[in-house]
C-alpha cells in the first residue's frame, strides 16, 4: 500500500478511508503544486487509470465517485497533467478499505487441556469482515468481581496461573473493528468442569488365533483424572460407516478392548475421552490401522449377532462419514446398535 508518500496537495475519502462494503464512495484530490496550473487531474486505482465518474470541481480539485464500492482494499492515487511536463506529477495517495462490522461472536467454548497450564477459549467469528478485527476476551471472577481482558485474533490461551483467585468465572468476547462492536453471550465457567483429559492413544492391536478370532486393542492416557468416559470408533478402511463403543476407563493401567471383526480386513480405530459427566471431549485420536488375520475355518460372520466387547460397554452405535475426504466430520445414523439388534435412538454427535 501507499504508506509514506510526500503529497503535493491532499486526498480525502467520504465517508472515510475505511467504510462499509457496498457503500457509495467519493474520493477527492486537491493539488497544491508549485509552478503548475493542471490541465487535468487523474485518478488511479491499484495503478490503473480511472476513466469514468470523475468530476472537476474547480481549478485545484477533482472528485471520483464509486457506486457500491465492494473491493476489500484499494490503493488510490491522483496525478496532475502540468503544461510543459512530459510525465504526470504525483499529488497524493491513500489506502482505502471496505468491510463489515463484526458479527457477535458465537459458540464460545473454554477448555483446559490437562497439563497444558492454560485455559483455551475459542469462538465462531461469523462472516468475514475484510478489515482488521480484534477480539477482546473478558474473564470476570464471580467470587472476587475482578476482570481480566485479553486481546486475540481468533482464539486465546490464558495461563491458569492468572486464574488462581477463583474457580468460577464469567467469560465473554467483544468483537471490535472500525465499523462496529458486538458482544458474545456470556459463558459461565467452573475451572473444575472444563478439563479435558490428557490425550488418549491407541498403542497397538493384535488378533488372536482362536477358533473365533478376536482383536484386542490396547490404549492408554497419561491422565490423572480418575473417572473417565471414552468412546472408540472403528470401521473397515473401505467402509463409510463407523461403529462406536463406549467405555468407563481407568487409566492406572493400559486399557484392553476386545472386538470380533471381519477376517482379512483392514480396520481403522480412533478413541476419545472426557471426564465422566462433563461436556468437553478430547479430539479423536490419530487413526490406528490394524489388519485382521485371515479366516482359518469357514465361519459365517454376522455383525449383528457377534459378541462385541469383553469390557463393560453401554452402547454400540453406527456413524457415517459425510465424505471420504473429511473422515473427522461424522453424521449419526438413526439406528443405534444395542444388545446385538438395530434399534432407534439418539446419540451424541461425533466429529
Amino acid at each position: 500500500g501507499i504508506t509514506s508518500i510526500n503529497c503535493s496537495g491532499d486526498m480525502w475519502v467520504e465517508p472515510g478511508e475505511i467504510f462499509q462494503m457496498g457503500m457509495n464512495v467519493s474520493i477527492y484530490c486537491q493539488e497544491a503544486l508549485k509552478h503548475c496550473r493542471p490541465r487535468n487531474l487523474y485518478f488511479y486505482k491499484n495503478g490503473f487509470k480511472e476513466e469514468f465518474d470523475i468530476t472537476r470541481i474547480n481549478r485545484t480539485t477533482a472528485r471520483i465517485w464509486y457506486k457500491g464500492f465492494s473491493e476489500p482494499h484499494a490503493y488510490m492515487h491522483c496525478t496532475a497533467e502540468c503544461p510543459g511536463h512530459f510525465q504526470e506529477t504525483l499529488i497524493c495517495g491513500k489506502d482505502i478499505s471496505s468491510g463489515h462490522p463484526p458479527d457477535a461472536p458465537s459458540n464460545l467454548t473454554c477448555v483446559i487441556y490437562e497439563y497444558s497450564g492454560n485455559m483455551t477459549c475459542t469462538w465462531n467469528t461469523g462472516k468475514p469482515t475484510y478489515i482488521d478485527t480484534k477480539y477482546i476476551v473478558h474473564v470476570k471472577s464471580l467470587e472476587t468481581e475482578e476482570e481480566q481482558q485479553y486481546l486475540a485474533s481468533s482464539y486465546v490461551k490464558i495461563s491458569t496461573d492468572s486464574l488462581q483467585g477463583s474457580r468460577k468465572y464469567l467469560v465473554w468476547v467483544q468483537a471490535v473493528n472500525s465499523l462496529g462492536m458486538e458482544n458474545s453471550q456470556q459463558l459461565h465457567v467452573h475451572l473444575d468442569d472444563i478439563v479435558i483429559p490428557s490425550a488418549s492413544i491407541i498403542s497397538r492391536a493384535e488378533t488372536t488365533n482362536d477358533t473365533v478370532p478376536k482383536t484386542i486393542v490396547y490404549w492408554k492416557s497419561k491422565t490423572m483424572i480418575e473417572k473417565v468416559f471414552c468412546e472408540m470408533r472403528y470401521k473397515t478402511t473401505t467402509n463409510q460407516t463407523w461403529s462406536v463403543k463406549e467405555f468407563d476407563a481407568n487409566f492406572t493401567y493400559v486399557q484392553q478392548s476386545e472386538f470380533y471383526l471381519e477376517p482379512d480386513s483392514k480396520y481403522v480405530f480412533q478413541v476419545r475421552c472426557q471426564e465422566t459427566g462433563k461436556r468437553n471431549w478430547q479430539p479423536w485420536s490419530s487413526p490406528f490401522v490394524h489388519q485382521t488375520s485371515q479366516e482359518t475355518g469357514k465361519r459365517n460372520w454376522q455383525p449383528w449377532s457377534s459378541p462385541f466387547v469383553h469390557q463393560t460397554s453401554q452402547t454400540v452405535s453406527q456413524v457415517t462419514a459425510k465424505s471420504s475426504h473429511e473422515p473427522q466430520k461424522m453424521e449419526m445414523l438413526s439406528a443405534t446398535i444395542f444388545r446385538g439388534h438395530p434399534a432407534s435412538g439418539n446419540h451424541q454427535d461425533i466429529g
Epitope: Q149, Y150, L151
Partner: nanobody, 116 residues
Framework: QVQLQESGGGLVQPGGSLRLSCAAS????????MRWVRQAPGKGLEWVSG???????IYADSVKGRFTISKDNAKNTLYLQLNSLKTEDTAMYYC??????????GSQGTQVTVSS
C-alpha cells in the same frame, strides 16, 4: 484504591514526538489490561489505544502507525509514545483500566498541544 497519574504532555510542533506515562497503584498492574483515551477541546472522549496483560495491542485508526502503547510491569507504568503528531492530536490524554472503551475513571490527565 485504584490510582492513576498521567504525565509527559506538553506543547509540540506538528511532526514532533512526545512520550506519555501513567503511574498506576492500588491493583495488580501486571494482570490488568490498560488503555489511553483522549478528549479534544469541545469534543467527547475518544478511545486511542489498549494493551492487555501479555502486551498485545490495539489502536484507533486515527493513530495507527504513529502511536505506540506499552507497559512496564516492574515499574507499574503504562506508556504512550506519540510520533508524527498532527494538530488534531491536541487533547487531554487519560489512562484507564481495560483495553477498550471511551471512558476513564476520573484521573487528572495530561495535556498534549500540537501547534506551530
Amino acid at each position: 484504591q485504584v490510582q492513576l497519574q498521567e504525565s509527559g504532555g506538553g506543547l509540540v510542533q506538528p511532526g514532533g514526538s512526545l512520550r506519555l506515562s501513567c503511574a498506576a497503584s492500588g491493583f495488580t498492574f501486571r494482570l490488568t489490561a490498560m488503555r489511553w483515551v483522549r478528549q479534544a477541546p469541545g469534543k467527547g472522549l475518544e478511545w486511542v489505544s489498549g494493551i492487555d496483560s501479555r502486551g498485545s495491542t490495539i489502536y484507533a485508526d486515527s493513530v495507527k502507525g504513529r502511536f505506540t502503547i506499552s507497559k512496564d510491569n516492574a515499574k507499574n507504568t503504562l506508556y504512550l509514545q506519540l510520533n508524527s503528531l498532527k494538530t488534531e492530536d491536541t487533547a487531554m490524554y487519560y489512562c484507564a483500566q481495560g483495553v477498550y472503551g471511551d471512558t476513564y475513571s476520573g484521573s487528572q490527565g495530561t495535556q498534549v498541544t500540537v501547534s506551530s
